[in-house]
């Protein structure tokens, strides 16, 4: 069992969904779990989040906000063998840019 490389970082806008892949070469029903190292608290033990969503072990986090920031790590286990762990993907949550003034309706501008 071995893991493919994962992206070092993922940037998602506030309120959007984050999709994390956990590519591995297991052909069997590998068990994928996801863990998070909290942003700004890297000495704390990784936090258990839960299983992957599909046979590929994708993690989907809906409606992300700033507190979702951190490093997301997947672990893959086949049977009772020791698990393999990804290097982790750093989630950065981006504030969407404000709408430019010119986007406003003419009525709003003239008020």
């Amino acid at each position: 069992l071995w893991m493919h490389k994962v992206p070092a970082s993922l940037m998602v806008s506030l309120g959007e969904d984050a999709h994390f892949q956990c590519p591995h070469n297991s052909s069997n029903n590998a068990n994928v779990t996801w863990w998070r190292v909290l942003h700004g608290n890297y000495t704390w033990p990784p936090e258990f989040l839960g299983p992957g969503e599909d046979p590929n072990g994708t993690l989907i986090i809906q409606n992300v906000n700033k507190s979702h920031g951190g490093i997301y790590v997947c672990r893959v286990q086949e049977g009772n063998e020791s698990y393999q762990q990804s290097c982790g993907t750093y989630l950065r949550v981006r504030q969407p840019p404000p709408r430019p003034f010119l986007d406003m309706g003419e009525g709003t501008k003239n008020r």
Partner: antibody
Amino acid sequence: EVQLLESGGGLVQPGGSLRLSCAASGLTFTSYAMNWVRQAPGKGLEWVSGISGSGGGTYYADSVKGRFTISRDNSKNTLYLQMNSLRAEDTAVYYCAKLGGWSDYWGQGTLVTVSS
Amino acid sequence: QSALTQPASVSGSPGQSITISCTGTSSDFGSYNLVSWYQQHPGKAPKLMIYEGSKRPSGVSNRFSGSKSGNTASLTISGLQAEDEADYYCCSYAGGSTWVFGGGTKLTVLG
């Protein structure tokens, strides 16, 4: 502070239905797989059902499979358990819980009584 | 999905040490070491005492310790105190988002 608040319990007749809710606050709810765990009077803890963070994966104990449905509304930070075809042996306190690792959170539970 | 096996009851005098065992199969425990121990007083929700086999959450007394060897996990309480009298449950991750609990052990503090 993390809070999980269950509601929806009560007295129901055998064969009846009930829907439990669990309102979560103080945690990044959408990140976590969530679970329902029950405890019959004077008995031990029993895992009932679990759901992945986005709701794409659902899991059930054999004792409730085909009768209970777990779901979540991530826009409302709420977990649900729809219980149909209830039996006397489903009588228990039902806890909403995020299990595993150091971030392990439980509600105070809601009592479901199935009796005629 | 059969329960993990725990002794129904254990007892000890104040100041003594006791150990509660929790036995399962290799599929119950896997290699993730996601084994937790809970303390439950009557009418209360379970309280996490040990996570990932041997780690103590902040705020839990260092009189509580956990270990795991093969398919058996153990909880040891040293320097027994009256307030330790409660029910204790082990719990293990069993893949997907499924979990299995032990049947529970009633701890009696004598005298």
